[in-house]
């Protein structure tokens, strides 16, 4: 059943969607598999805090501990990755803060992507000292499990030495790894003893074994790659926005709604209004009016600007954002003060000046 009555028909018209919204990305907390993660809910004056993951209620279990404003995840796994939210319920309102958890290893196995120190791994031996292959930098091989978000680049390294200089080849799940086994193939940098796969996809999951050998012996090392799929999600609105604002009669004010959405968002600014002297319809639902929405003939829909305000403009303003997956909304109040008789220009107080450009 609808939660409000619209004053006018707001069937959404065709829109022009030229922009991709990647605004106000939620804070990201990164943990390696097996590590523990602790996050504090960054909301003030929280009487009761509830937690969700990917829109589903999160309760305590043997690995998840909820103590006051803290969320603890023990022995994190890639499945703990996702969009988390804490909601602070107060006596008069509630507020939600979103953050991402990414349980993943770094891009490369133990060093930076640019391989600046790679030349050190290429060890030259005295030609008289024949030697079977050996690892030259085991620290770069310690992390065997690599949980990587889809579309990222993965690099596995097996720095080795030996005399004569060993050769390196790679296996996937125990079989020869061929270029045609994945779209885009892969790169092998022999000088850096590395395998590089760009834009990984779920089918890249598996065990990758480097085999390093010369005529005196052979050694191998196996990495496990897990590709964490991302999936589309409903819009996220930056906590605390729009912010409450106040101004004098005749002043100007702006409300800002910061949106993060993978899919194209439809933004609406809605206000509670009166119709025939009543704030509520016959069904008991409040009357709402759409003041602005994204699409044709609409400038930056994330900002609602009110000019030369009157006392009638006071009230609650709702930023409502929808994509094809779901919805999110947050609201703010506008207080309109009587115009002071003092000489000189009134100073208007705008919402969230930090976010205005």
């Amino acid at each position: 059943r609808p939660s409000f009555s619209l004053v006018e028909d707001t069937t959404l018209e065709p829109e022009e969607p030229p922009t991709k919204y990647q605004i106000s990305q939620p804070e990201v907390y990164v943990a390696a598999p097996g590590e523990s993660l602790e996050v504090r809910c960054l909301l003030k004056d929280a009487a009761v805090i509830s937690w969700t993951k990917d829109g589903v209620h999160l309760g305590p279990n043997n690995r998840t501990v909820l103590i006051g404003e803290y969320l603890q995840i023990k022995g994190a796994t890639p499945r703990d990755s996702g969009l988390y939210a804490c909601t602070a319920s107060r006596t008069v309102d509630s507020e939600t803060w979103y953050f991402m958890v990414n349980v993943t290893d770094a891009i490369s196995s133990g060093d930076d992507e640019d391989d600046t120190d790679g030349a050190e791994d290429f060890v030259s031996e005295n030609s008289n000292n024949k030697r079977a292959p050996y690892w030259t930098n085991t620290e770069k091989m310690e992390k065997r499990l690599h949980a990587v978000p889809a579309a990222n680049t993965v690099k596995f390294r097996c720095p080795a030495g030996g005399n004569p200089m060993p050769t390196m080849r790679w296996l996937k799940n125990g079989k020869e790894f061929k270029q045609e086994h994945r779209i885009g193939g892969y790169k092998v940098r022999n000088q850096h003893w590395s395998l590089i796969m760009e834009s990984v996809v779920p089918s890249d999951k598996g065990n990758y074994t480097c085999v390093v050998e010369n005529e005196y012996g052979s050694i191998n090392h196996t990495y496990h790659l897990d590709v964490v799929e991302r999936s589309p999600h409903r819009p996220i609105l930056q906590a605390g926005l729009p912010a409450n604002a106040s101004t004098v009669v005749g002043g100007d004010v702006e409300f800002v709604c910061k949106v993060y959405s993978d899919a194209q968002p439809h933004i609406q600014w809605i206000k509670h209004v009166e119709k025939n002297g009543s704030k509520y319809g016959p069904d008991g639902l409040p009357y709402l009016k759409v003041l602005k929405h994204s699409g044709i003939n609409s400038s930056n829909a994330e900002v609602l600007a009110l000019f030369n305000v009157t006392e009638a403009d006071a009230g609650e303003y709702i930023c409502k954002v929808s994509n094809y997956i779901g919805q999110a909304n947050q609201s703010a109040w506008l207080t309109v003060l009587p115009k002071q008789q003092a000489p000189g220009r009134e100073k208007e107080i705008t919402a969230s000046p930090d976010y205005l450009e």
């Epitope: 065709p14 829109g55 194209q264 929808s322 094809y324 779901g326 919805q327």
Partner: antibody, heavy 113, light 106 residues
Framework: EVQLHQSGTVLARPGASVKMSCKTS????????MHWIKQRPGQGLEWIGA????????NYNQKFKGKAKLTAVTSASTAYMDLSSLTNEDSAVYYC??????WGQGTTLTVSS | QIVLTQSPAIMSASPGEKVTMTCSAS?????MSWYQQKPGSSPRLLIY???NLASGVPVRFSGSGSGTSYSLTISRMEAEDAATYYC?????????FGGGTKLEIK
């Protein structure tokens, strides 16, 4: 496991009305739009509209306004679509889908006198 | 409304062959989705947000494009890929689908 289960095949007379259902399980029903799609025999796909169960918001394709009525019962995690004043043009398979990656198996509607 | 035009309407390919089909939009879009449908079955999501592979979809499928021009590529055709493919936009109301490309096996 996410599942969307739609009601079975319907045979109706011209001028009549029908109601089909889409029962969901395995995900938070209220958090996602439920879209309805029409596919005429041997034809392509048409978006009818969508309902957001959490608050009852509905968006219709203008073409189907007055023809389709979408509702949802959150306690049963089920979405419904009513089709009225049926004609032969309404004979089709109707799908419910959420997020684009969860689909029902389809309800076949045949309108015939 | 945004009209999506798919081409070709019908095509055939031999096993192992590379297949590319296109979808042209009447207005610029942010993203495109692609579906596969076989007779008697529901559509199956292959690609979302233009280039993201949906869960469980073989890596031989890929999507690309921007603005008004998008494409779906199958790197190596397999017999099980014979189906009708639809592009769809979730950017602008009313959401619309292309007319479909029917892919047959030679």
């Amino acid at each position: 496991e996410v599942q969307l289960h739609q009601s079975g095949t319907v045979l109706a007379r011209p001028g009549a009305s029908v109601k089909m259902s889409c029962k969901t399980s395995g995900y938070t029903f209220t958090n996602y739009w439920m879209h309805w799609i029409k596919q005429r025999p041997g034809q392509g796909l048409e978006w009818i509209g969508a309902i957001y169960p959490e608050n009852g918001d509905i968006n219709y394709n203008q073409k189907f306004k007055g023809k389709a009525k979408l509702t949802a019962v959150t306690s049963a995690s089920t979405a419904y679509m009513d089709l009225s004043s049926l004609t032969n043009e309404d004979s089709a398979v109707y799908y419910c889908t959420s997020r684009g990656d969860y689909w029902g198996q389809g309800t076949t509607l045949t309108v015939s006198s | 409304q945004i009209v999506l035009t798919q081409s070709p309407a019908i095509m055939s390919a031999s096993p192992g062959e590379k297949v590319t089909m296109t979808c042209s939009a009447s207005s610029g879009l942010s993203y495109m989705s692609w579906y596969q449908q076989k007779p008697g079955s529901s559509p199956r999501l292959l690609i979302y947000d233009t280039s993201n592979l949906a869960s469980g979809v073989p890596v031989r499928f890929s999507g690309s494009g921007s603005g008004t021009s998008y494409s779906l590529t199958i790197s190596r055709m397999e017999a099980e890929d014979a189906a009708t493919y639809y592009c769809q936009q979730w950017s602008s109301y009313p959401y619309t689908f292309g007319g479909g490309t029917k892919l047959e096996i030679k």
